[in-house]
Interface confidence: low
């Protein structure tokens, strides 16, 4: 929707004659008729499809036209249209002599025409006036014209409707191209979505107005990032609302049962080791020289026979000392000085003498390690899982837990890229070795068929009431040339019913 504006500036008819050459008596009382229509390569008579306008008598013979209301007429002249501006036009300006006060066509003699000009061409929507001057043998007309959009209409063709608003349905102003520009604190396609307090949890918080953070049920805190645990939860936390996940050492529905008596009460004395053995129960493992439930009683350190492999124990003031037999050493004579003759290699390891038999080295079979081949190899140490998969030991074998998008024993296979239906507008997806390709249907292009390509806008027969359809190939839009008695962008309205649709 917009307005074609025509500003008449000066008309020169020095001899005061009509187009026929006959002079006006007493002078040419001049008024103008303007006809705006769709583009024609050769401007011909016919309906003024874009509108008509007439002026009152503006002057006699030669005169300048003031750029305001003049004798009740408007200057610039306004030719409103309520369709998408096609970017091209034809314009006919006729200067007529009015012998009397009745300016209706039927009231004028046919030879009252002073001059007639016809132009056509392209005209983009914009604020700038195009100045033109048309000269005939007897007359000269200077004028300028432009096309501007109506209020609330924007874009190159005045086809985008945008009304600024700040209410339940949106909070925005309109940009020059008709796109919405959200007011501060609002977002979304129609700026209906408030921008919550910075850091407000995306899922657990929300807001009804900007810079607010309201918590959904089960969540709390300034940013709604703290869940509310179950009522009565004593020694527990939650990761989702109404949970009660017990802290270490606590059990029961409300985490009020003490499972870690050792930590909470330290019952074992004299450096003993405490082990929890159930709710409120524990076991103390005493250091040598102590006994009792809580290792609270001291005894002779040699009473516990701490020396192994036949070592003899000697009490000392600050403890005890083991005298080891030949071939053994260590605090409790627990280490032996072995050689290959003692078969020290376990799990089928081979023994190799070193330093002339003073010590040895074990060569372990696969899956075993350690100085005596006593340790089983962790199958996951070689990290066999590809593409960031997680390796899990499962008995004698191993398995890989794959990241999303990968599969196979070792996560070596990509899940089909086409599974996500990435091709828009009905495009066909083809899996390739390193990606995918979309084959687009007619009328669409781009890597994902997201680009609408040029189509014949008239193909769908959008014009009603036997109107003629013209395609504007530069914008893929159409213009309907209405038959007499109908108006509207699709010629859908009988004359006298100006359309005003919000849709």
């Amino acid at each position: 929707s917009g307005v074609f504006q025509l500003q008449l500036q000066e008309f020169i008819n020095e001899r005061g004659v009509l187009a026929s050459g006959r002079p006006c008596e007493p002078g040419c009382r001049t008024f103008f008729r303007v006809c705006l229509k769709h583009f024609q390569a050769v401007v011909s008579p016919g309906p003024c499809t874009f509108g008509t306008v007439s002026t009152p008598v503006l002057g006699t013979n030669s005169f300048a036209v003031r750029d305001d209301s003049s004798g009740g007429g408007r200057n610039p002249l306004q030719l409103p249209f309520n369709f998408t501006w096609p970017g091209t036009f034809s314009l006919i300006i006729e200067a007529w002599h009015a012998p009397g006060d009745d300016l209706r066509p039927e009231a004028l003699p046919p030879d009252a025409l002073i001059s007639k000009i016809a132009i056509q061409g392209s005209l983009a929507v914009g604020q700038n006036w195009l100045l033109d001057e048309q000269t005939s043998t007897l007359t000269r007309l200077r004028y300028s014209y432009r096309v501007i959009c109506s209020d609330n209409y924007y874009g190159d063709n005045c086809s985008r409707l945008c009304k600024k608003r700040n209410d339940h349905f949106g909070h925005y102003v309109c940009q020059p191209d008709g796109n919405l520009s959200c007011l501060p604190g609002w977002t979304g396609e129609y700026c209906q979505q408030p921008i919550c307090l910075s850091g407000c949890h995306e899922q657990n918080g929300y807001c009804s107005k900007p810079a607010e953070c309201l918590c959904r049920p089960g969540w709390q805190g300034r940013l709604c990032n703290e869940c509310i645990p179950h009522n009565g939860c004593r020694h527990g936390t939650c990761s989702t609302p109404w949970q009660c996940t017990c802290d270490e050492g606590w059990g029961g529905l409300f985490c009020d049962q003490d499972l870690n008596y050792c930590t909470h009460h330290s019952p074992c004395k004299n450096g003993a080791t405490c082990s929890n053995s159930g709710q409120r129960s524990y076991t103390c493992t005493c250091r040598p020289g102590y006994t009792g439930v809580d290792c609270e009683l001291e005894l002779s350190e040699c009473d516990s026979n701490p020396c192994r492999n036949g070592g003899s124990c000697k009490d000392q003031e600050d403890g005890y000392h083991c005298l080891c037999p030949p071939g053994y050493y260590g605090l409790h004579c627990e280490h032996s000085t072995l050689s290959c003759a003692d078969s020290p290699c376990f799990n089928g390891g081979s023994c190799r003498e070193r330093n002339q038999g003073a010590n040895y080295a074990c060569e372990c079979p696969p899956n075993f390690t350690g100085s005596n081949c006593e340790k089983k190899v962790d199958r996951c140490t070689s990290n066999p899982c590809a593409n960031g998969g997680q390796c899990l030991n499962r008995g004698p074998s191993r398995m890989c837990r794959c990241r999303p998008g990968f599969t196979g024993t070792y996560c070596e296979l990509h899940v089909s890229d086409c599974a996500r239906n990435p091709c828009a507008h009905g495009g066909t997806c083809h899996d390739l070795e390193n990606g995918l390709m979309c084959t687009c249907p007619a009328g669409f292009s781009g890597r994902r068929c997201e680009v609408r390509t040029s189509i014949d806008a008239c193909a769908s027969s959008p014009c009603f009431n036997r109107a003629t359809c013209y395609t504007d190939l530069s914008t893929d839009t159409f213009v309907c040339n209405c038959p007499y008695g109908f108006v509207g962008s699709r010629c859908e309205f009988p004359v006298g019913l100006p359309p005003s649709f919000p849709w």
Partner: antibody
Framework: QVQLVQSGSELKKPGASVKVSCKAS????????MHWVRQVPGQGLEWMGI????????SYAQKFQGRVTMTRDTSTSTVYMELSSLRSEDTAVYYC???????????????WGQGTLVTVSS | QSVLTQPPSASGTPGQRVTISCSGS????????VNWYQQFPGTAPKLLIY???QRPSGVPDRFSGSKSGTSASLAISGLQSEDEADYYC???????????FGGGTKLTVL
């Protein structure tokens, strides 16, 4: 809050005209289009037309062309629907309803008046 | 004769799930979005679902809408006695240019 208050019930003779009013409050009157919808007793809803309170422009359903006139008075935030050449089959409850729209182009009769019963009988 | 076609009646027992269909054409449901309205006897209709599947604030999530091609449907889960009402579907029709309604479905809770 948004409120649409309609005029009271009317009893009319065939051939006469009726003018129903709908007074809006609680929002910017010129920001929203207004529909008129009627419901014949025991039957469904039927759209009659729409008016833009800002400029006063209208669009009427084909069925009511020439018989219906929708106007507005911005000073009182009121829209009017006048139906002429009444017939007995025009006996119905007439509703006004605000319309919110955006570029996705959906019909959204968001708030409704309480309805006005028009009875046409000789 | 309504432009959009709805079954004249539907019924269900409390707690049940019921669906109401609405059939149209390419010029209405096929190319535009669908709204659903609830109407109790003697009162004005109330917007229940807009833009095919959006619920205005205050409408319980027991009500849901969907659209496929030239048809739409309204689903009510966990049926309650207070859901007994008339339900209408509506869509803009490109030809003629204006909103069209379904004939309405009377829902009875047994």
């Amino acid at each position: 809050q948004v409120q649409l208050v309609q005029s009271g019930s009317e009893l009319k003779k065939p051939g006469a005209s009726v003018k129903v009013s709908c007074k809006a409050s609680g929002y910017t009157f010129t920001s929203y289009y207004m529909h008129w919808v009627r419901q014949v007793p025991g039957q469904g809803l039927e759209w009659m037309g729409i008016i833009n309170p800002s400029g006063g422009s209208t669009s009427y359903a084909q069925k009511f062309q020439g018989r219906v006139t929708m106007t507005r008075d911005t000073s009182t935030s009121t829209v009017y629907m006048e139906l002429s050449s009444l017939r007995s089959e025009d006996t119905a409850v007439y509703y006004c309803a605000t319309d919110y729209y955006d570029s996705s182009g959906y019909v959204d009769f968001d708030y409704w008046g309480q309805g006005t019963l028009v009875t046409v009988s000789s | 004769q309504s432009v959009l076609t709805q079954p004249p009646s539907a019924s269900g027992t409390p707690g049940q799930r019921v669906t109401i269909s609405c059939s149209g054409s390419s010029s209405n449901i096929g190319s535009n979005t669908v709204n659903w309205y609830q109407q109790f006897p003697g009162t004005a209709p109330k917007l229940l679902i807009y833009r095919n599947n959006q619920r205005p604030s205050g409408v319980p999530d027991r009500f849901s809408g969907s659209k496929s091609g030239t048809s739409a449907s309204l689903a009510i889960s966990g049926l309650q006695s207070e859901d007994e009402a008339d339900y209408y579907c509506a869509a803009w029709d490109d030809s003629p240019n204006g909103p069209v309604f379904g004939g309405g479905t009377k829902l009875t809770v047994l």
